[in-house]
């Protein structure tokens, strides 16, 4: 006859492991008993359990409550056992020794491998600001046994570097993602992907990138100077900029205080019916925690009567 087992049995931490041992006998052979022992190199054999064809299962005190036979129906030639709730300390070599009648004893060894799935963590780097050089965007760490694989999934251009630390029964892997911050990266996902044989599927942790920036400011509303004449209603100036975090706006007049009746509404400066006293230099001040920008424009409120007089003069001059 011959003894069938596996070279390696792999189990995830906390789960149950089936340790196979099956005797395929020649004609009429019977299995009397099966003895299971832990047989790591350099240490004496430690008995797990004894399966007797007549007296059933006897589990050694060290494994009490943790070793069982598979449920029936069970082939009488099957000496497999179930090791409940595998822990890392269970990793090692096991031997199954089968006593048969009349062929004698057979033995086989297997290695139990206990997988410790990782619990990955992602740590964002320092605040990202446009204009910085190569900067740490995030680091991702995962510890397990065997060492997990840590990669990145993103549309963002960057560089990665990994390092690992070996512990007695596991390994920690840290991967860093570096990039040169630009405003186009704002809101883009950066995903750490952790692979491990103890995971049914890859674990993914996503970090959304925030890049601080402030665009140049500009003022809209003066595109047609001829609209800025005395008596015009609804005239307004709008300050244009964008940034992360979203900027705040402030309006001032360079050559004095804002005229009465002028309304400041965030990025917009609203004027009452225009008079010549609204002429002047207006400054839009844009700022966020990252930077500040200014844009200034000159408002020249036209007097239509003066204009028509000039036009007549010009005509008559010709």
């Amino acid at each position: 006859g011959e003894l069938e087992t596996s070279d390696v049995v792999t189990v995830v931490l906390g789960q149950d492991a089936k340790l196979p041992c099956f005797y395929r006998g020649d004609s009429g052979e019977q299995v009397g008993q099966v003895a299971w022992a832990r047989v790591d190199a350099g240490e004496g054999a430690q008995e797990l359990a004894l399966l007797h064809s007549k007296y059933g299962l006897h589990v050694s005190p060290a494994y009490e409550g943790r070793v069982e036979q598979p449920p029936p129906p069970r082939n009488p030639l099957d000496g497999s056992v179930l090791l409940r709730n595998a822990v890392q300390a269970d990793e090692g070599e096991y031997e199954c020794r089968v006593s048969t009648f009349p062929a004698g004893s057979f033995q086989a060894r297997l290695r139990l491998r206990v997988l410790v799935p990782p619990l990955p963590s992602l740590n964002p780097g320092p605040a990202l600001e446009e204009g910085q050089g190569l900067t740490l965007a995030a680091s991702c760490t995962a510890e397990g046994s065997p060492a997990p694989s840590v990669t990145w999934d993103t549309e963002v251009k960057g560089t990665t570097s990994s390092r690992s630390f070996k512990h007695s029964r596991s390994a920690a892997v840290t991967s860093e993602f570096h990039l040169v911050p630009s405003r186009s990266m704002n809101g883009q996902p950066l995903t750490c992907v952790v692979s491990h044989p103890g995971l049914l599927q890859d674990q993914r942790i996503t970090h959304i990138l925030h890049v601080s920036f402030l665009a140049e400011a500009s003022v809209r509303g003066l595109e047609d100077q001829n609209l800025w004449h005395i008596g015009r209603e609804g005239a307004m100036l709008k300050c244009l900029s964008e940034g992360q975090p979203p900027p705040s706006y402030n309006w001032t007049r360079l050559d004095g205080p804002l005229p009465s009746g002028v309304r400041v509404d965030g990025d917009t400066l609203g004027f009452p019916p225009l008079t010549t006293e609204h002429s002047g230099i207006y400054v839009c001040h844009v700022s966020n925690e990252f930077s500040s920008r200014d844009s200034q424009v000159t408002v020249d409120v036209l007097d239509p009567q003066e204009d028509s007089g000039k036009q007549v003069d010009l005509v008559s001059a010709s």
């Epitope: 019977q30 449920p71 082939n75 009488p76 030639l77």
Partner: antibody, heavy 118, light 107 residues
Framework: QVQLKQSGPGLVQPSQSLSITCTVS????????VNWVRQPPGKGLEWLGV???????DYNAAFISRLSISKDISKSQVFFKMNSLQADDTAKYYC????????????WGQGTSVTVSS | DIQMTQSPASLSVSVGETVTITCRAS??????LAWYQQKQGKSPQLLVY???NLADGVPSRFSGSGSGTQYSLKINSLQSEDFGTYWC?????????FGGGTKLEIK
């Protein structure tokens, strides 16, 4: 080569017993167990029981009270007997050898079609 | 009883394509699972035992995988002779139940 040949009646009266013989060749019943499985017309497979190489038996818990499996090693025969048949026991009955580590059926008989009807 | 949920119940596939049939057990069956093929009017034939081991004489385009409660049978480069019904069966606790079957038809 390994073969399992079945013989048995095609028609059984309600409440009567069904007996099927599975004669094997190409292997010894002292080395391998034999399972019994049935399949109602157009339906799925249902495991009924097994007799192991050493002679011990295991039955599907739902059939334990009316099922008996035995063997005659010298004749290379396995005997299947089910009592108190009803119309819903109408099925094709198969014997199948246990293979590999004992937990698979690697060779099957041709099947015996059984109709339970008066 | 351990329930074996097999999917899909049926599928129609062209020759040369790849097919995957899955079987989910209601509890851990420790890879004690076999796959069979059955053609119309014939007895089942063993394809895979112990969840991943190919039975003798079975073409290498068949492969079994899985552990715990999730198992699958994959057929690469489907051949015309692969049509029929496929069954999974567990061997962990009484009774040893079969899945509901997957009828594979060739387009």
């Amino acid at each position: 080569q390994v073969q399992l040949k079945q013989s048995g009646p095609g028609l059984v009266q309600p409440s009567q017993s069904l007996s099927i013989t599975c004669t094997v060749s190409g292997f010894s019943l002292t080395n391998y167990g034999v399972n019994w499985v049935r399949q109602p017309p157009g339906k799925g497979l249902e495991w009924l029981g097994v007799i192991w190489s050493g002679g011990s038996t295991d039955y599907n818990a739902a059939f334990i009270s009316r099922l008996s499996i035995s063997k005659d090693i010298s004749k290379s025969q396995v005997f299947f007997k089910m009592n108190s048949l009803q119309a819903d026991d109408t099925a094709k009955y198969y014997c199948a050898r246990e293979g590999y580590d004992g937990y698979a059926m690697d060779y099957w008989g041709q099947g015996t079609s059984v109709t339970v009807s008066s | 009883d351990i329930q074996m949920t097999q999917s899909p119940a049926s599928l129609s596939v062209s020759v040369g394509e790849t097919v995957t049939i899955t079987c989910r057990a209601s509890e851990n069956i420790f890879s004690s699972l076999a796959w069979y093929q059955q053609k119309q009017g014939k007895s089942p034939q063993l394809l895979v035992y112990g969840a991943t081991n190919l039975a003798d004489g079975v073409p290498s385009r068949f492969s079994g995988s899985g552990s715990g409660t999730q198992y699958s049978l994959k057929i690469n480069s489907l051949q015309s002779e692969d049509f029929g019904t496929y069954w999974c069966q567990h061997f962990w606790g009484n009774p040893w139940t079969f899945g509901g079957g997957t009828k594979l038809e060739i387009k």
